[in-house]
Amino acid sequence: LEVQVPEDPVVALVGTDATLCCSFSPEPGFSLAQLNLIWQLTDTKQLVHSFAEGQDQGSAYANRTALFPDLLAQGNASLRLQRVRVADEGSFTCFVSIRDFGSAAVSLQVAAPYSKPSMTLEPNKDLRPGDTVTITCSSYQGYPEAEVFWQDGQGVPLTGNVTTSQMANEQGLFDVHSILRVVLGANGTYSCLVRNPVLQQDAHSSVTITPQRSPTGAVEVQVPEDPVVALVGTDATLRCSFSPEPGFSLAQLNLIWQLTDTKQLVHSFTEGRDQGSAYANRTALFPDLLAQGNASLRLQRVRVADEGSFTCFVSIRDFGSAAVSLQVAAPYSKPSMTLEPNKDLRPGDTVTITCSSYRGYPEAEVFWQDGQGVPLTGNVTTSQMANEQGLFDVHSVLRVVLGANGTYSCLVRNPVLQQDAHGSVTITGQPMTFPPEA
């Protein structure tokens, strides 16, 4: 019995659903009563899911697996794994026994995009040329371990005096902290790039340091030039700092965070007290850091509706304000591919291939190509619909006339995260039946 699985690992984002494809060729007169199907972990042989005696025996794997019952009779033994976790990563064996039998293993590669790095300086004020500063680049909740690169404003790699640590949390996701020690010149830009090797996703941030003259008491309000990119559901820090004058006390500080366009109050600190969040109770200051001039705002459980510009207004004796942009993003799921019609296909037939990817933000860019990498632009219709949370579901339809055989790939790109999610379908053999990937 020929059991077929994809050669390449199935890449799944943490929290999304993954389909482990497995197909077999049913013999004439085959009935489900004859089918025995076992999915198990390749290494430990732990049972994951099974079908026997004409019945789905259910999930033996945390109730997160399912078969495609309507497709089993056509030879589709694929397994749906829901709410993927880091611990799911590894090899799964699909064992099919009818009269003949066979098995094959498919690899699941789990991934999670890294957040846009935040940059901190120590010391962060009264800097002068010749001072040694420690620049820390931190990026959160990614998988697998990241590759971290530093470079200066001219793009020259900085490799000396770099220490990188990666710690996994209970979910197995990594927080990356990379520390660069440099001696300041007259001024300089330092960039940190955090790469997810599986997703080929690069997240980068930079900091420009202009050494200051002695403080005069003037309030210089500083925010990052680049937008702060935050994943939906995560927390974001809108950085804002000012230079406290000598003898400054928090009793003198008046701090207002508000939406730049509508002037809606978000959070304030005045009369020596944190006045609290005026923005759905999802904001917080860093009270222990205010006295050092850190007026940053923490925005919790980021939503698509939070996207936009936030103004940080500081008034002591002098006053100043600056606006920081929040760019919200959500990774797109690995596309699922469906064919219509999906059986008895012959060269010359016109088929409709649908590529669907879910719950991303902002709107995606969709690209189709053939097995040789040649772009397919004709007869493509793409629609993107936002749900109540503002996340987009993408459906792209390609109409093609079949050749003797062919591979059709769909790539869904998140333009903000620079995250590419792709799916492909190979149509071979005549006549043939396609077991669709769900």
């Epitope: 309000v221 008034s315 100043g320």
Partner: antibody, heavy 118, light 111 residues
């Protein structure tokens, strides 16, 4: 002694322009935000515009936005207000004031009169 | 029409205590400190109270300020004839991104 001295007021026709100056002395000018506040004859105080110590941030009342421009020259310890497209309702005594804690204004000039009339 | 509302006038006799109110909203007095100014006839305004209740040096302790919610008040005890002046409250309004004044209260000392 801390002092602010306004100048540049006068009579101007509607639609005309005028530039007010405020010379500061007796304190580190660049360490303080500065304001322009006006008072029409027989009326109350109206805040017009403000500028941060470095000049990097500026603020305007809606009534003058797009017509007035505040600026400062810290090397000359001088604050300016460029007033364009003047209207009769801009007629007032214009005061410059030094920014203070809690959004206050602790030092005021003696004022300069701007009259917009044909 | 001023963002902060003050009574146009108030009066009292020497030695009396008078109070001047200033009413605003959540985006100004409700969330930011209040300052008070005294303007004697023909002169520039002078800072009288800052940060709701603090007196700059040189201001007599007969003048006091307080704030509650979206309102503030200036109290003058032991009224003197030289207190006859216009009094203005002022705050910062976050929804306007600007400083705002009350319309002013003319205080008359009788007798």
């Amino acid at each position: 002694e801390v002092q602010l001295l306004e100048s540049g007021g006068g009579l101007v026709q509607p639609g005309g322009s005028l530039r007010l100056s405020c010379a500061a002395s007796g304190f580190t000018f660049s360490s303080y935000g500065m304001h322009w506040v006006r008072q029409a004859p027989g009326k109350g105080l109206e805040w017009v515009s403000a500028i941060s110590g470095s000049g990097g941030s500026t603020y305007y009342a809606d009534s003058v936005k797009g017509r007035f421009t505040i600026s400062r020259d810290n090397s000359k310890n001088t604050l300016y207000l460029q007033m364009n497209s003047l209207r009769a309702e801009d007629t007032a005594v214009y005061y410059c004031a030094r920014g203070y804690y809690y959004y206050g204004m602790d030092v005021w000039g003696q004022g300069t009169l701007v009259t917009v009339s044909s | 029409q001023s963002v902060l509302t003050q009574p146009p006038s108030a009066s009292g006799t020497p030695g009396q205590r008078v109070t001047i109110s200033c009413s605003g909203g959540s985006s100004n007095i409700g969330s930011n400190p209040v300052n008070w100014y005294q303007q004697l006839p023909g002169t520039a305004p002078k800072l009288l109270i800052y940060g709701n209740n603090k007196r700059p040096s040189g201001v007599p302790d007969r003048f006091s300020g307080s704030k509650s919610g979206t309102s503030a008040s200036l109290a003058i005890s032991g009224l003197r004839s030289e207190d006859e002046a216009d009094y203005y409250c002022q705050s910062y309004d976050s929804s306007l991104s600007g400083w705002v004044f009350g319309g002013g209260t003319k205080l008359t000392v009788l007798g």
